[in-house]
């Protein structure tokens, strides 16, 4: 009959930080030099032996005289309660056929972690525990005095637990969140009535979950060093040095080498000159709670990230071409580089690709003259494209060329006794056509009636007009723009000896917010185009004179500009240009982009006051300088009479008072006889002009009293 192999010499040690019990024991009566498969059943009780909280089996092969070890982690801190452990065994080996039976239990081993020392009446456990966000944690308090009421608070909010015995209460905290890197605060308060007997607290250090490094990548710029980078994600460091930032280690499996990285998001790896081409890297992130790793496998020649090109220069720069040169850092013999050139200028971008060996060169053509360009270049391995280098760039400016377009020229001709005064205007050439800085304009005046006679006026830039006094002959005027290289084509305009068409009637037009829509009858005969010019009606014509060229087959145009202001009248003239470049005035138009109500009222005089009538006149009132076309006048009259005078009708003023109103529809009718009045009567009048936008401003009424019948004025 077999002896039961009872476990003996059971010893239990504790690890408070890990909240673990470590058991060690031996087995008696084991045959000498024999190995047996055995099962051990372990029972763990809490507070009292009858309160079994865990039972489990542990299977192992046991040798003679062997000390066996087994550990168990408690969810409750060991300081919270006394634990009891016992063990029994069963032989489970083919060498011993059935029946097998369990040994007796070992005696209970009591485990008590005493941290409840001193005079304190309250303790909270565990102290300074480090856990990962989302884990479940059990805490407890131990109260010396069961008469005390103990309340516990997590971050200032009361929590409720389960009483394990009169002195101990445990709290299960489910899925603890990360709150701050200095930990989650928990405190308990012992009180009797409203007297606080003591407070104790712990910090639960909750770490963010360590993330797998993202975007792990390695590359070389010189075949000497591999530069590896990654996104480390959240830093899991905690305060009070409870957990430092996660560490990063590079491990290369082909060479078996390992390197602890000193930076959180990059690491350099020395390439040994043993022609290793393939690398298999594992990046390991590690903190006190876990490890995370990522892997990359690559061929070294496929991971070349070149240093940026250098010595970028421009040679043989002229007005339209340049040769761009650059150098690349040589990293291996017979290496082919693919380079990309970007050319920025005049708001445009061009891109070119070129393959090179050592030094780069590219012919840049079709450039604009006198233009600053920014050219930049980047390169990559042409054989195994990995990524572009950084850009290297430089600015250069092309040389000037002669202006390529004639200036846009127009004129105002005013007739004076015995001569013409011609005011000549031109628009500055656009950058595209100036091809450099315009220095001066040549104005050549040629008398067409005396062909040998011509005059040259040189006008320094940036002037854009000049005044010429010419006699009553026909003249051809040429305007040429000049820069440092040469002259533009000439702009030609002819001034006829005949006076301009004076018979043209001025037509009123209404503008819109978008500007003025103009149309005209085509000029009989051949025309090479039309010109519309305009200016502010009330100002000196030179102030804001503008013009627009219109093609020969067009008889309408829209003049739209932000310069048009409400309440300002603009005068437009439309000219036809003959094949001989003689301008003929076709139409005149005038109007407002937006009419406004009159800005002032007329100054009214009272004439010929009699006992039965008086005359009102405002002859000095100018209808021209108003913010809209004056359409007429409203005459307001107040009197004691109930009825309005003939031609007047009842009206209500803005203040609600009643009066009589008479409307004059002719803006040039600037007088009114008010008759059928009573002698020695009191009258009040007020006259205001009106436009399509409304009346003039409100004003006070003027008082008039008619004399008696026998008086004479």
């Amino acid at each position: 009959e077999r002896l039961p192999l009872t476990p003996v010499s059971l010893k239990v040690s504790t690890n408070s930080t890990r909240q673990s019990l470590h058991l060690q024991w031996t087995v008696h009566n084991l045959p000498y030099h024999q190995e047996l498969k055995m099962v051990f059943q372990i029972q763990i009780s809490r507070i009292e032996t009858s309160n079994v909280i865990w039972v489990g089996n542990y299977s192992t092969t046991v040798k003679w005289n062997q000390v066996l070890h087994w550990s168990w982690e408690s969810e409750l801190p060991l300081e919270c309660a006394t634990h009891f452990v016992r063990i029994k065994s069963l032989v489970d080996d083919a060498k011993f056929p059935e029946p097998n039976f369990w040994s007796n239990w070992s005696s209970w081993e009591e485990v008590s972690v005493q941290d409840s020392t001193g005079q304190d009446i309250l303790f909270v456990f565990p102290k300074d525990k480090l856990v990962e966000e989302g884990t479940n944690v059990t805490i407890c308090y131990v109260s010396r005095n069961i008469q005390n009421n103990v309340s516990c608070y997590l971050e200032g909010k009361q929590i409720h637990g389960e009483q394990l015995d009169p002195h101990v209460t445990a709290f299960n905290l489910n899925s603890v969140p990360f709150i701050r890197n200095k930990g989650t605060n928990i405190y308990c308060e012992a009180s009797q009535g409203n007297v606080s007997e003591g407070m104790k607290g712990i910090v639960l250090f909750v770490s963010k979950v360590l993330e797998e490094p993202k975007d792990f990548s390695c590359e070389t710029e010189d075949f000497k060093t591999l530069h590896c980078t990654w996104d480390p994600g959240t830093d899991t460091a905690l305060g009070w040095s409870k957990q430092p930032s996660q560490s990063y280690t590079l491990f290369e499996s082909f060479s078996g080498e390992k390197k602890l990285c000193t930076h959180k998001n990059w690491c350099n790896w020395q390439i040994t000159q043993d022609s290793q081409e393939t690398y298999n890297f594992t990046l390991i992130a590690e903190n006190y709670l876990r490890k995370r790793s990522v892997n990359i496998l690559f061929n070294l020649t496929h991971r070349v990230y070149l240093m940026n090109p250098f010595s970028v220069n421009f040679e043989n720069v002229n007005a339209t071409n340049a040769i761009m040169t650059w150098k690349v850092h040589s990293i291996r013999n017979n290496f082919t580089y693919l380079c990309q050139i970007e050319l920025h200028g005049e708001g445009k971008m061009m891109q070119y690709n070129v393959s090179i060996k050592v030094n780069g060169e590219y012919f840049l053509s079709e450039l604009e003259p006198a233009t600053e360009y920014m050219a930049r270049v980047r390169c990559a391995d042409a054989s195994h494209f990995w990524k572009w280098s950084e850009w290297s760039g430089q600015n250069f400016t092309t040389l000037e060329a002669a202006p390529s377009e004639a200036p846009d020229v127009w004129r105002i001709v005013s007739l004076e006794p015995g001569n013409h005064t011609v005011t000549l205007f031109w628009k500055p050439l656009s950058k595209l056509h100036a091809n450099g800085k315009i220095l001066f304009y040549n104005v050549v005046v040629e008398n067409l009636d005396k062909p040998s006679s011509s005059e040259l006026h040189s006008i320094p830039a940036p002037a854009n007009s000049t005044k010429l006094i010419l006699d009553r002959c026909s003249y051809q005027i040429c305007v040429i723009a000049n820069n440092s290289v040469g002259a533009s084509p000439a702009s030609v305009i002819v001034i006829s000896a005949d006076p301009e068409n004076k018979e043209v009637e001025e037509e009123r037009i209404a503008g819109t917010e978008g500007g003025f829509s103009l149309s005209w009858k085509p000029q009989p005969g051949d025309v090479i185009g039309y010109v519309v010019d305009w200016c502010d009606h009330t100002q000196d014509v030179l102030g804001d004179f503008q013009w627009k060229n219109v093609g020969p087959n067009t008889t309408s145009t829209v003049i739209s500009t932000d310069a048009f202001r409400p309440g300002v009248r603009y005068d437009f003239r439309i000219y036809g240009l003959s094949t001989k470049r003689i301008a003929c005035l076709l139409e005149k138009k005038t109007g407002y982009s937006q009419e406004l109500a009159p800005s002032d009222n007329p100054h009214v005089l009272v004439d010929t006051l009699t006992s039965h009538s008086f005359t009102l006149s405002w002859k000095d009132y100018s209808t021209e300088s108003q913010p809209g076309f004056i359409q007429g006048y409203h005459v307001y009259l107040k009197s004691k009479a109930r009825q309005c005078h003939p031609r007047f009708e009842k009206a209500v003023l803005s203040d609600g008072s009643e009066c009589c109103k008479y409307k004059i529809d002719n803006p040039e009718e600037k007088a009114l006889i008010v008759d059928n009045l009573k002698p020695e009567s009191f009258y009040e009048f007020f006259i205001t002009p009106f436009t399509s936008a409304g009346e003039g401003p409100s004003a006070t009424f003027t008082k008039v009293t008619t004399p008696d019948e026998h008086s004479s004025m």
Partner: antibody, heavy 119, light 109 residues
Framework: QVHLVQSGAEVKKPGASVKVSCKAS????????ISWVRQAPGQGLEWMGW????????NYAQKLQGRVTMTTDTSTSTAYMELRSLRSDDTAVYYC????????????WGQGTTVTVSS | EIVLTQSPGTLSLSPGERATLSCRAS???????LAWYQQKPGQAPRLLIF???SRATGIPDRFSGSGSGTDFTLTISRLEPEDFAVYYC??????????FGQGTRLEIK
């Protein structure tokens, strides 16, 4: 930024009462207790008592029992300390301090309120 | 009630020297519950050390605390001009009262 801001200086006659306020900002008021400490001119620090901001429970130094009351208004994150039957030896600077029960120290202090008791 | 006795009452040293301040308890104090404070004239005290040896936030590493049971020490490894002040030790048990030592004045020699 964590701050404790106390009310201004007071001058009182013997037998009168004084009430000092301490307004907290920059942290969860109910996560920490408040201790009151005083310092007579040229003397050391004397603990007067503490207040549990969550429960309102208090514990007072034996020598002040019956004369001192500590209260809290969690809606305004303000603690108050009232001292009655003032004597000339109550002349001192009165400090409120945040009691941190996680590392058992007073880690944030008010600027102090001078109370002068004089006839 | 636990009585804390600090020594010396006054300590005269020069900048750059090492300062050692002592705090003795009338009965055993858990090291978790001993703190040190610095106070300058006209200012509130400032927490330097908690749990006998842990530096509070923002305290330079020239300040260190040690000790257990009844004997505790505050050491300033290399005095800076701004370190001259009064230093207090304080104990906290979960049973009141909290008590302070009488203070050590650290002055420039």
């Amino acid at each position: 930024q964590v701050h404790l801001v106390q009310s201004g200086a007071e001058v009182k006659k013997p037998g009168a009462s004084v009430k000092v306020s301490c307004k907290a900002s920059g942290y969860t008021f109910t996560s920490y207790g408040i201790s009151w400490v005083r310092q007579a001119p040229g003397q050391g620090l004397e603990w007067m008592g503490w207040l549990s901001t969550y429960s309102g429970n208090t514990n007072y130094a034996q020598k002040l029992q019956g004369r001192v009351t500590m209260t809290t208004d969690t809606s305004t994150s303000t603690a108050y300390m009232e001292l009655r039957s003032l004597r000339s030896d109550d002349t001192a600077v009165y400090y409120c301090a945040r009691g941190n029960f996680y590392y058992y120290g007073m880690d944030v202090w008010g600027q102090g309120t001078t109370v002068t008791v004089s006839s | 009630e636990i009585v804390l006795t600090q020594s010396p009452g006054t300590l005269s040293l020069s900048p750059g020297e090492r300062a050692t301040l002592s705090c003795r308890a009338s009965q055993s104090v858990s090291s978790s519950y001993l703190a040190w404070y610095q106070q300058k004239p006209g200012q509130a005290p400032r927490l330097l050390i908690f749990g006998a040896s842990s530096r509070a936030t923002g305290i330079p590493d020239r300040f260190s605390g040690s000790g257990s049971g009844t004997d505790f020490t505050l050491t300033i490894s290399r005095l800076e001009p701004e370190d001259f002040a009064v230093y207090y030790c304080q104990q906290y048990g979960s049973s009141p009262p909290i008590t302070f030592g009488q203070g050590t004045r650290l002055e420039i020699k």
